[in-house]
């Protein structure tokens, strides 16, 4: 048997089952592309020299078996062995020291078996009617979710409780409440309705302080940027015991503390100042940038130490947002302006490195042009997102650029830099015979492909050399074949293709000849 | 290994209905794939139905489907066959078996290391 495919025989290891109850569980199976599986489990117990087989039987009732050797994860294709649209039964057997260990099984179909996300980011918790409410967002593209959580305190064990069915973009959870005692609470979820679904990991603790409180200790959580291009930083005030869970542990406890908040905004380095301190009773507003915040805490000793969080950027992009236009003497961008007399800050990174490495420039104050738009132009002797790559780019606006809390996020996008309809080029342009009457083009994807939102479409040109007719095709930017019908035999052809942005119309490949053979009958 | 008891055989006429019951004893019975199994006189023993340990999927011989239910309580140890529209043809010895591993097919008998001793059942036109 292939090691990429499912193996419909025997296994290669005699039935010598354990019983132990050690060995293969947690067993979790989904799709993880268009076509492609994966499987991963845990071992308990000693590893060496364990060899895991995956188990499966068809609703056929035939039953095969994937070798993993020592790994615990495993992925194979659509194509084997295993059918995907109907219903499997998968189970691990682990073979080691002469027996067998058989991990719980799971039942499903696995094309529709999704990686279900447990919840992600901010958990809100709140009171409600002398229960715990959670809220969180639902994971995207996780709608329909069956949700379970987890509790303990600093002297129970792990309790298990049913959330129930969710189907909405928030989910919510209505858990107990302790009077005197913290407790750390764990969600997960899996798909809803899925017979055997998987369950997801379980999230990050979510530590609760008790109904009672003691003395406040700081946290914050980030919301969502606004249309405005602004998010509020938040400050949750979190209560905290001497004894917390085990998951819950190193928050120090506080005293009677004054707090000052220190905001470091890390993007767009060209800017006049960079950090803003302020009372922490007055929360500010945020650009999409990333920054560093500080809490300084001060008691009537004197000061503490400084808690420090770092805010990710909002790596949302928008990429109809920005236009491009390049001419002879330069490039020019235009986006929708945001006021009369705003300083904008344009940062640019190439894909793929470093946050360190961006580069950015901040326009005079300037107002919208007759079309409501602002624009940042440059040359090309400037050397600004002139190599040909893929280069994410964000700007903010501010109409008080010396005011930290007062710069928003316009836009975030990607632009392919230098001369893109030359360098998006496709090459490796290749025709096959398809029928009597067609063929199949085939070219390497564009270096535009790279770069998200960039590459609008690729476009086939076929000219008949005799007649000289020419007809386009235009293609998906995610396709790379094109299928040509209608043609005749004996003719010559030539066949190039080129790859179109949104701005730009690309270069076409060299042309490739080809010709259909006359089929002669006997 | 684990032992299998089956109960529940008996004489029916055409058309009725009988419930088989096996119940195991011995090694965890949560870690058997459950199989049922017939021999009619001067034939082969053919599969009847099967069920997987976690007693999701199931499986049936064409002979049976949408007539037979196989189903399984793991906290009971018991493995159980629901026939309904009994035919004469279903006349046979009913053998409950167990696989604590199973091969190329849920169907083929060399799967199963455990027998009961069985259970006659005899439908009468």
């Known amino acids: 048997c292939r090691t990429s495919e499912c193996c419909f025989q025997d296994p290669p290891y005699p039935d010598a089952d354990s019983g132990s109850a050690s060995g293969p569980r947690d067993l979790r199976c989904y799709r993880i592309s268009s076509d492609r599986y994966e499987c991963s489990w845990q071992y308990e117990g000693p590893t060496a020299g364990v060899s895991h087989f995956l188990r499966c039987c068809l609703s056929s009732g035939r039953c095969c078996y994937f070798a993993a050797g020592s790994a615990t994860r495993l992925q194979f294709s659509d194509q084997a062995g295993v059918s995907v649209l109907y219903t499997v039964t998968l189970w691990v057997e682990s073979w080691a020291r002469n027996q067998t260990e058989k991990s719980p099984e799971v039942t499903l179909q696995l094309y529709n078996s999704v990686k279900y996300e447990p919840p992600l980011g901010d958990i809100k918790v709140s009171k409600l009617a002398g229960q715990l409410r959670m809220e969180w967002e639902t994971p995207d593209n996780q709608v329909g979710a069956e949700v379970q959580f987890r509790h303990r305190t600093p002297s129970s064990p792990w309790k298990l409780g049913d959330c129930g069915p969710q189907d909405d973009d928030t989910e919510s959870c209505l858990c107990p409440l302790e009077m005197n005692v913290a407790q750390e609470f764990q969600l997960r979820r899996r798909q809803l309705g899925s017979q055997g679904s998987s369950w997801s990991k379980w999230s990050s603790p979510v530590c609760v302080p008790p109904e009672n409180p003691p003395q406040p200790q700081v946290r914050f959580s980030v919301e969502q940027l606004g249309q405005d291009g602004r998010r509020r930083l938040t400050l949750k005030e979190q209560p905290t015991q001497l004894e917390l869970p085990e998951g819950c542990q190193g928050l120090a406890p506080g005293t009677e503390v004054t707090y000052r908040l220190q905001l470091h905004m890390l993007s767009c380095p060209c800017k006049a100042k960079a950090t803003r301190t302020l009372h922490l009773g007055k929360m500010p507003y945020l650009s999409g940038a990333a920054y560093n915040v500080a809490v300084i805490s001060s008691n009537q000793f004197g000061p503490g130490l400084n808690q420090t969080w770092h805010i990710p950027a909002d790596t949302h992009t928008e990429p109809v947002a920005l236009n491009i236009s390049v001419g002879t003497n330069g490039t020019t961008m235009y986006w929708p302006a945001r006021a009369q007399s705003m300083t904008y800050c344009i940062e640019w990174q190439p894909v793929g490195q470093d946050g360190g490495l961006a580069t950015c420039s901040l326009t005079a104050p300037q107002d919208p042009d007759p079309a409501g738009m602002a624009t940042y132009s440059w040359s090309r002797e400037s050397g600004a997102m002139g190599q040909e790559k893929c280069y994410y780019i964000t700007i903010f606006a501010s109409a008080h650029p010396e005011k930290l809390t007062l710069w928003s996020t316009v836009l975030s996008t990607y632009h392919f830099g230098g001369n893109a309809s030359a360098a998006g080029t496709p090459h490796h342009v290749s025709v096959k015979n398809h029928s009597l009457d067609s063929v199949s083009v085939d070219w390497a994807p564009s270096l535009l492909s790279t770069c998200p939102g960039v590459l609008k479409e690729y476009v086939v040109r076929c000219r008949d050399e005799d007649s000289k007719q020419v007809s386009e095709h235009p293609v998906q930017p995610t396709e790379t074949q094109v299928t040509l019908s209608g043609l005749r035999a004996g003719v010559a052809y030539t066949v190039q293709v080129r790859a179109d942005t949104a701005w730009l119309r690309g270069v076409w490949s060299q042309p490739q000849r080809f010709s259909i053979e006359v089929q002669v009958s006997d | 290994q684990v032992q299998l008891v089956e109960s529940g055989g008996g004489l029916v006429q055409a058309g009725g209905s009988l419930r088989l019951s096996c119940a195991a004893s011995?090694?965890?019975?949560?870690?058997?794939?459950m199989g049922w199994f017939r021999q009619a006189p001067g034939q082969e023993r053919e599969f009847v139905a099967a069920?997987?340990?976690?007693?999701?999927?199931?499986y049936y011989a064409d002979s049976v489907k949408g007539r037979f239910t196989i189903s399984r309580d793991n906290a009971k140890n018991t493995v159980y066959l629901q026939m309904n529209t009994l035919k004469p043809d279903d006349t046979a010895v009913y053998y409950c078996?167990?696989?604590?591993?199973?091969?190329?097919?849920?169907?083929?008998?060399?799967?199963?290391?455990?027998w009961g001793q069985g259970t006659q059942v005899t439908v009468s036109s």
């Open positions: 069920i997987m340990r976690n007693g999701i999927m199931t």
């Open positions: 011995g090694r965890t019975f949560s870690s058997y794939v």
């Open positions: 078996a167990a696989a604590s591993r199973v091969g190329v097919s849920i169907s083929q008998s060399s799967s199963y290391t455990s």
